[in-house]
């Protein structure tokens, strides 16, 4: 079989379930610093009608609030529309549904355009295995290693997970 790694084998449904945020990257460092709008952490995901539904954890006032977001499908298989702090074109850049997922977003907010990338894994004990893949995606969207933030347990709202 030859082709392209466009979508998860078996479709978006394979992305359903629990995920853990491992790393973030952005060309605007403030967005992913503590209290930045995109310093958010994945809790779980599900897919329905080609749309992606995500529960994310947002640090607020020393606690973590769970918020549900929906990324709506577009005519392009790996692209979704997401409204969160402005409009986001969300792309699935590299996916292995059983192991890891790398997405990036082009955010438009108040006439300002930003780039944010996110690495999430199924099993936190294997997070180091997928950082090279994340660095590769970041390079290919014009982000540098020094623009990547690798998260710690304290960062990612681990205490808020059920």
């Amino acid at each position: 079989q030859e082709g392209n790694h466009e979508e998860p084998q078996g479709g978006l449904e394979e992305l359903s379930g629990r995920w853990h945020s491992v790393a973030l990257a952005s060309n605007k460092s403030d967005l992913i610093k503590p209290w930045g709008h995109f310093r958010v952490f994945i809790h779980s995901m599900s897919a329905k009608d080609g749309n992606l539904h995500g529960d994310i954890l947002i640090p607020q006032d020393g606690q973590c609030e769970k918020v549900s977001l929906t990324a709506f499908k577009t005519a392009t298989s790996n692209k979704f529309d997401l409204e969160y702090w402005g409009h986001n074109d969300l792309y699935l850049a590299e996916v292995d549904p059983k192991s890891y997922l790398i997405l990036y977003m082009i955010n438009q907010y108040n006439d300002d355009t930003s780039l944010v990338a996110h690495l999430m894994v199924r099993d936190l004990s294997r997070q180091q295995d997928f950082l090279p893949a994340f660095e590769s995606v970041c390079e290919d969207i014009g982000l540098h290693k020094d623009q990547i933030v690798v998260l710690s347990d304290d960062d990612r709202c681990q205490g808020s997970r059920d």
Epitope: Q1, N4, E6, E94, S136
Partner: nanobody, 121 residues
Framework: EVQLVESGGGLVQPGGSLRLSCAAS????????MGWYRQAPGKQRELVAT????????MYADSVKGRFTISRDNAKKTVYLQMNSLKPEDTAVYYC??????????????WGQGTQVTVSS
């Protein structure tokens, strides 16, 4: 083994055009991203353009937006870079990069050997 072979470089006058090609060959199961980078003398390598998966999603460096177009032919495992309105500052060695799986679940980055583009009158 996987090989990336670039072609299409050369000498062109300012305002001119060139089309670069990069063909992947060898043991290939899947190809994800294909893209172009460049390195000018004394400078760091920089991203020019990337084509994600089927080519519906692309990313360009600000310096080439509106002048360069990346495209790909998946059947031929080839990525192209159409460069128009070339400027002297586009002079560099242009490298192809591809994210390739030789078997399911294993991804690696592969680079071509580079092709020289010189923009000069």
């Amino acid at each position: 083994e996987v090989q990336l072979v670039e072609s299409g470089g050369g000498l062109v006058q300012p305002g001119g055009s060139l089309r670069l090609s990069c063909a992947a060959s060898g043991t290939i199961f899947l190809i994800n991203r294909m893209g172009w980078y460049r390195q000018a003398p004394g400078k760091q390598r920089e991203l020019v353009a990337t084509s994600f998966t089927s080519g519906n999603s692309t990313m360009y460096a600000d310096s080439v937006k509106g002048r360069f177009t990346i495209s790909r032919d998946n059947a031929k495992k080839t990525v192209y870079l159409q460069m128009n309105s070339l400027k002297p500052e586009d002079t560099a060695v242009y490298y192809c990069k591809a994210r390739i799986s030789r078997r399911y679940g294993n991804w690696d980055d592969y680079w071509g050997q580079g092709t020289q583009v010189t923009v000069s009158s």
